[in-house]
């Protein structure tokens, strides 16, 4: 543990003004494991100035970072990039005259203390005021600038000409599109400063590039996969002061697959069951020997789990017996296309 | 032995309705989807729809809906097809045929039945 | 919707001789996970109904002789008939059946 810290398995805490640490405090090899401290506290740490990019890193599961009454000054953009878990942030009378919403704008923080802190009134900050603003009453904090005449400003009053929220709109507003198929998304960005556009398409796993041109952008996603059907993808806007973003949700329309199909078992009732994918939702129908098998109550298709465009499902029977054994053909279809798969059921004799 | 019996050549007038029968016999009705073709004079097939007779489900080419309305009675295993508001273009041979093989094949074929749309 | 088309329209063969007809789909008709493809083929003889000759493109229908064959995958049939006999003659359809079902527009067989 760093000279002038106390360290536990969860939490290291640097309190003591003399020597005091002049960087960040880093365990030694074959100590505690650093993916498992949650805490951090750093008090009366004048010769504290920087955060480098990869001082913090190795705290993965840091969730609280508290450095008060501190000479911070300076936080580099990727300081928190792989501290994704950090939900507590008390920066509280340092020596901060800038921070950007960049260090912070993967984080899903609670907590964003920065009161005591000598900023300099400027479009850089005016995310901050952006921030207070949408924050409830109970949780804003008082947050000065120092303007031109070095005098104190309330953050609340700040006033800086072109310095505002950009804006994002995207061309689709909802996105059908057949399973192999491409498709271009076009959006436009303004504000000022100019925003940068950036594309979050998630998880997507069909094949997409992207162009981008000052304010205006494209996306083409190419041989759309039927696992993109209901992810969402949004075109962002992002400058200083914050970003807007503009979302559509794709629908890809694909022909049926029966995934599952197995043997009956029993529990309450007797079920042959299955998984089918499609969409729109294929409709089933069930053949019993080759012939059409008309349900009934004591036979009859149930869905059980709908999971977007899979539905899990039994054909149930009540009660059968040897006259029910034989072979069960499910057909799903829908207007993309079809499918059938068959299963062998011996219930009894 | 399987057989689709249609039921005779019918003349009628334009913008009259007909009703036109397949009796099924040799194999139950119900086990089968029923599907309604058309073959204009000298012209391909196309398929009008098929009805499980089970339920009464249907389903139509787009371009029949509105045209062609498909049934069936049980007790008498026969099925139905009824073509409204008739045209000079709807005078064709109408087929019924069996659907096997999970309904995607015509295994067994009606006769045919003529019908001539003329004033 | 899938549009079904045939070629030649007609051809005249003599007795004893092979011939092929093509069938093309405006789309694939090949099931991915059972690699079925959901074509079949009809032949109809004048002043007749149409029979089924070959299912899943390339099953026999039973009681079909066996110098018709089908083949293909996807979206590109054929028939064969190895040897024609004199009873041939008629126009022959294929029709698909992944989505709802389309007839092609027939091939005429005529016998020289």
């Known amino acids: 543990c760093p000279t002038s810290c106390k360290c536990s398995s969860a939490r290291i805490w640097c309190t003591e003004p003399s020597p005091g640490i002049v960087a960040f405090p880093r365990l030694e090899p074959n100590s505690v494991d650093p993916e498992n401290i949650t805490e951090i506290l750093i008090a009366n740490q004048k010769r504290l100035e920087i955060i480098n990019e990869d001082d913090v890193e190795a705290y993965v599961g840091l969730r609280n970072l508290t450095i008060v009454d501190s000479g911070l000054k300076f936080v580099a953009y990727k300081a928190f990039l792989k501290n994704s878990n950090l939900r507590h942030i008390n920066f509280t009378r340092n020596k901060l005259t800038s921070l950007s919403r960049r260090h912070f704008r993967h984080l899903d923080l609670s907590d964003l203390i920065l009161t005591g802190n000598p900023f300099t009134c400027s479009c850089d900050i005016m995310w901050l005021k952006t921030l207070q603003e949408t924050k409830s009453s109970p949780d804003t904090q008082d947050l000065y600038c120092l303007n031109e005449s070095s005098k104190n400003m309330p953050l609340a009053n700040l006033q800086i000409p072109n310095c505002g929220l950009p804006s994002a709109r995207l061309a689709a507003p909802n996105l059908t599109v057949e399973e192999g198929k491409s498709v271009t998304l076009s959006c436009s960005v303004g504000g000022d400063p100019l925003p940068t556009l950036y594309w979050d398409v998630g998880n997507l796993v069909s094949k997409h590039m992207n162009e981008t041109s000052h304010t205006q952008g494209s996306l083409r996603i190419t041989n759309i996969s039927s696992d993109d059907s209901g992810k969402q993808i949004s075109c962002v806007a992002e400058n200083l002061v914050g970003e807007d973003q503009d979302s559509v949700n794709l629908t890809v329309h694909f022909a049926p697959t029966i995934t599952f199909l197995e043997s009956p078992t029993s529990d309450h009732h007797w079920c042959i069951p299955f998984t089918v994918r499609g969409n729109p939702k294929p409709a089933l129908q069930w053949f019993y020997n080759g012939a059409i098998l008309n349900e009934s109550k004591y036979i009859c298709t149930k869905i059980h789990v709908t999971n977007h465009t899979e539905y899990h499902g039994c054909l149930q029977l009540d009660n059968p017996t040897h006259m029910n054994n034989g072979d069960y053909t499910l057909m799903a279809k829908n207007e993309y296309g079809k499918d059938e798969r068959q299963i062998s059921a011996h219930f009894m004799g | 032995e399987v057989q689709l019996q249609q039921s005779g050549p019918e003349l009628v007038k334009p913008g009259a309705s007909v009703k036109i029968s397949c009796k099924a016999s040799?194999?139950?009705?119900?086990?089968?989807?029923m599907n309604w073709v058309k073959q204009s004079h000298g012209k391909s097939l196309e398929w009008i729809g098929d009805i499980n007779p089970n339920n009464g489900g249907t389903s139509y080419n787009q371009k029949f809906k509105g045209k062609a309305t498909l049934t069936v009675d049980k007790s008498s295993s026969t099925a139905y097809m009824e073509l409204r508001s008739l045209t000079s273009e709807d005078s064709a041979v109408y087929y019924c045929a069996r659907g096997a093989y999970y309904s995607n094949y015509f295994d067994y074929w009606g006769q045919g039945t003529t019908l001539t749309v003329s004033s | 919707d899938i549009v079904m088309s045939q070629s030649p329209s007609s051809l005249a063969v003599s007795a004893g001789e092979k011939v092929t007809m093509s069938c093309k789909s405006s789309q694939s008709l090949l099931n991915s996970r059972t690699r079925k493809n959901y074509l079949a083929w009809y032949q109809q003889k004048p002043g007749q109904s149409p029979k089924l000759l070959i299912y899943w493109a390339s099953t026999r229908e039973s009681g079909v002789p066996d110098r018709f064959t089908g083949s293909g995958s996807g979206t590109d049939f054929t028939l064969t008939i190895s040897s024609v006999q004199a009873e041939d003659l008629a126009v022959y359809y294929c029709k698909q059946s992944y989505i709802l079902f389309t007839f092609g527009s027939g091939t005429q067989l005529e016998i020289k």
């Open positions: 040799g194999y139950t009705l119900t086990d089968y989807y």
